[in-house]
Each structure stands twice: as structure tokens, then as C-alpha cells.
């Protein structure tokens, strides 16, 4: 039951996380114009990965996609790539995890297959979350660098064709959404990996009853290892009985024909 709950919760947490990563990627508020010490108050600018928006003092807002002819910084392209990779990996992870859910029966899929799929989706969620966190962090670093560069250039650039950055930008809402969403996806992935351990078939060790035979003294000891008499070939305590592959949820305490020799 605990395995099913962990897997289900991991799936839900990852689903929320990936929805957040998609939302953050589409949002326009990755950076917002810093209003402190800014003489320009008639227009307020906020920017996303794909377009820039300006809110006029009249209340009218206009957005435009970035003009590709001017070229975009390599860092921005890298952030876009990281977010898209995160979304794609997350989406594939969600698809895989749906089929891996213990509560869903698809044909005669064995627990070992479900365990492998759970692990795969968990790893995908972890990588997806890391991509989102990395993308948002790279963008945040770019804003911090730009902020201090803008502050240094605030009263320079007069005369000649000098290009200075005058407007300073601070963290927008999308950055926080991205960080939280990436974290949730990461946590969900870890939960799926933990659930995988419980789903994986384990070798069950049975406690056996001690038994005295008429011939050589042979007994089964707990752990399923044959106690060697010194005459047999099993001198290295090799496991001579492999318990049936059963999941944690299916282990039964009833005596079976293998419990007694």
C-alpha cells in the first residue's frame, strides 16, 4: 500500500511540477523593469523568453515577439532550450509513469516491468526538474549581471554612438514559478525512484523449521542457506532455494509446500 501511495503521490507532484514548468516557460514576466531610481514612469516593461511587453500609463498593454534580426543573446537561447528539454522530458516521463502506476492494470504487465517504468519516469522527472531549475537560475544570473552593469552605466554614454543599458530589470514572477515547479518535479521524480524499490521483485527469505534426517545431519537455517556437513558439494554456502518473486504487498505468511522438507 505504501508503495502505491508513494508512486501515486510522486506522479501527482511531478504532474503539478511539469504544469508549472510549462506555465513558467509561457509567462511574460521573467524580468520586470526596476522602478527604483528610474526616471521613466510613463511606460512599464516586462519581458519573457519569447516576447517583450509594455504597459502604458493609459493602461494599454502591447506585446511584441523578439525581433530575430537583431539577434538574441546565446544565454537566452540556452534558457529556452533548457526549459523546452525540461518540458519534453517531463511529458514523456508522465506518459511512461501513467502505464507504470500500480493502481492501473494493463494486460498482464509484470511488476518488474512496472518497476523499470517507474524508475525510468522518476529519472526523467529528476532531469526535467534540474533542467527547469538550471534554466531559471541561468536567467536569474543574467538579470543580476545586467542589473549591476546597468547601475554602472546609469550616468554614462553621453555623446557619440554609445550603446548603454539604462533600464534595469529585476526578477519576475515566472522565475519563482519556475524554481518551485522545478523543485516539485524533482521531488516527484525522487518519490518515483523510491517507489520503484518497493515495486521491484525481491528474493524472499523464508524462516524454515529445523529438521533432523536419519542420514547425514542436514538442516535449513533462516536465510535459506544449506548447512554443510563437510561431505556435500555445497561448501561455499550457496543459496539452494530461491523464494518465489513476490512484491512487498503480496508476501503471504501461509505455510507452503516449500516450508518443510
Amino acid at each position: 500500500m505504501a508503495v502505491t501511495a508513494c508512486q501515486g503521490l510522486g506522479f501527482v507532484v511531478s504532474l503539478i511540477g511539469i504544469a508549472g514548468i510549462i506555465a513558467a516557460t509561457c509567462m511574460d514576466q521573467w524580468s520586470t523593469q526596476d522602478l527604483y531610481n528610474n526616471p521613466v514612469t510613463a511606460v512599464f516593461n516586462y519581458q519573457g523568453l519569447w516576447r517583450s511587453c509594455v504597459r502604458e500609463s493609459s493602461g494599454f498593454t502591447e506585446c511584441r515577439g523578439y525581433f530575430t534580426l537583431l539577434g538574441l543573446p546565446a544565454m537566452l537561447q540556452a534558457v529556452r532550450a533548457l526549459m523546452i528539454v525540461g518540458i519534453v522530458l517531463g511529458a514523456i516521463g508522465l506518459l511512461v509513469s501513467i502505464f507504470a502506476l500500480k493502481c492501473i492494470r494493463i494486460g498482464s504487465m509484470e511488476d518488474s516491468a512496472k518497476a523499470n517504468m517507474t524508475l525510468t519516469s522518476g529519472i526523467m522527472f529528476i532531469v526535467s526538474g534540474l533542467c527547469a531549475i538550471a534554466g531559471v537560475s541561468v536567467f536569474a544570473n543574467m538579470l543580476v549581471t545586467n542589473f549591476w552593469m546597468s547601475t554602472a552605466n546609469m550616468y554614462t554614454g553621453m555623446g557619440g554612438m554609445v550603446q548603454t543599458v539604462q533600464t534595469r530589470y529585476t526578477f519576475g514572477a515566472a522565475l519563482f514559478v519556475g524554481w518551485v515547479a522545478g523543485g516539485l518535479t524533482l521531488i516527484g521524480g525522487v518519490m518515483m525512484c523510491i517507489a520503484c524499490r518497493g515495486l521491484a521483485p525481491e528474493e524472499t527469505n523464508y524462516k524454515a523449521v529445523s529438521y533432523h534426517a536419519s542420514g547425514h545431519s542436514v538442516a535449513y537455517k533462516p536465510g535459506g542457506f544449506k548447512a554443510s556437513t563437510g561431505f556435500g558439494s555445497n561448501t561455499k554456502n550457496k543459496k539452494i532455494y530461491d523464494g518465489g518473486a513476490r512484491t512487498e504487498d503480496e508476501v503471504q505468511s501461509y505455510p507452503s509446500k516449500h516450508d518443510y522438507v
Epitope: 502604458e56 511584441r64 534580426l69 537583431l70 548603454t164 533600464t167 530589470y169
Partner: nanobody, 118 residues
Framework: EVQLVESGGGLVQPGGSLRLSCAAS????????LAWYRQAPGSQRELIAL???????QYGDSVKGRFTISRDNAKNTVYLQMASLKPEDTAVYYC????????????WGQGTQVTISS
């Protein structure tokens, strides 16, 4: 390459009028504002007036009611109509184009001298 060319500066008597113009050429992001700044000797740069691509305007406290900014989007030109000029309006007037592409860009003109003296 974006270029800003100012014109219209000169010597005017106190109380007189002057019209500055600034033409922007080249390719630039459509979300922007065109502004006029001035810098008197020994002083910091001061925002006089700006007009955004959407038509919003803003004026500095020292010129409110005396100066009027306008823009011709077809010609990518900004005009600053200055009236009731005072000796303290003497400065070098700079045209500024700020584009709102990724993290913003600023372009500056060479500046035009405006002198108010009798």
C-alpha cells in the same frame, strides 16, 4: 545600425521658442520610446520629455507646461517644441531611443547645443 540625428539647436533670447527634432534611422525593435535629455555643464543628465511607441508622454518637472513632445511614427522622428525659454534651459540636448527588446537597448545622438541668452 541605428543612428539618431538631432537638429534645431541654437541661440535664443529668454522667453523665445525653439523646435528640436531627432530622426532615427536603421532597424530597431518596435516597442520603444524616444526621449530628450539635457546636460548642463557640471550637472547630471536630466530627462526632459519622452514619448512611447504607444503614444504615452512624460515630462520633467522643470519643463512641464512649457515644452511639448510629439512623434511621427511614419518618419521615426521625435520633436520637442520649447516655449517660454529661460537661461537655465541652456544645455546640450540629447536624443535617446530606448528599445524594449531583450533586456533593453539605448541609442544616443551626438547632442545639439541650446543657448538662452540676451
Amino acid at each position: 545600425e541605428v543612428q539618431l540625428v538631432e537638429s534645431g539647436g541654437g541661440l535664443v533670447q529668454p522667453g523665445g521658442s525653439l523646435r528640436l527634432s531627432c530622426a532615427a534611422s536603421g532597424q530597431f525593435f518596435s516597442l520603444n520610446y524616444l526621449a530628450w535629455y539635457r546636460q548642463a555643464p557640471g550637472s547630471q543628465r536630466e530627462l526632459i520629455a519622452l514619448v512611447s511607441s504607444g503614444g504615452s508622454t512624460q515630462y520633467g518637472d522643470s519643463v512641464k507646461g512649457r515644452f511639448t513632445i510629439s512623434r511621427d511614427n511614419a518618419k521615426n522622428t521625435v520633436y520637442l517644441q520649447m516655449a517660454s525659454l529661460k537661461p537655465e534651459d541652456t544645455a546640450v540636448y540629447y536624443c535617446n531611443l530606448h528599445t524594449y527588446d531583450f533586456l533593453g537597448r539605448d541609442y544616443w545622438g551626438q547632442g545639439t547645443q541650446v543657448t538662452i541668452s540676451s
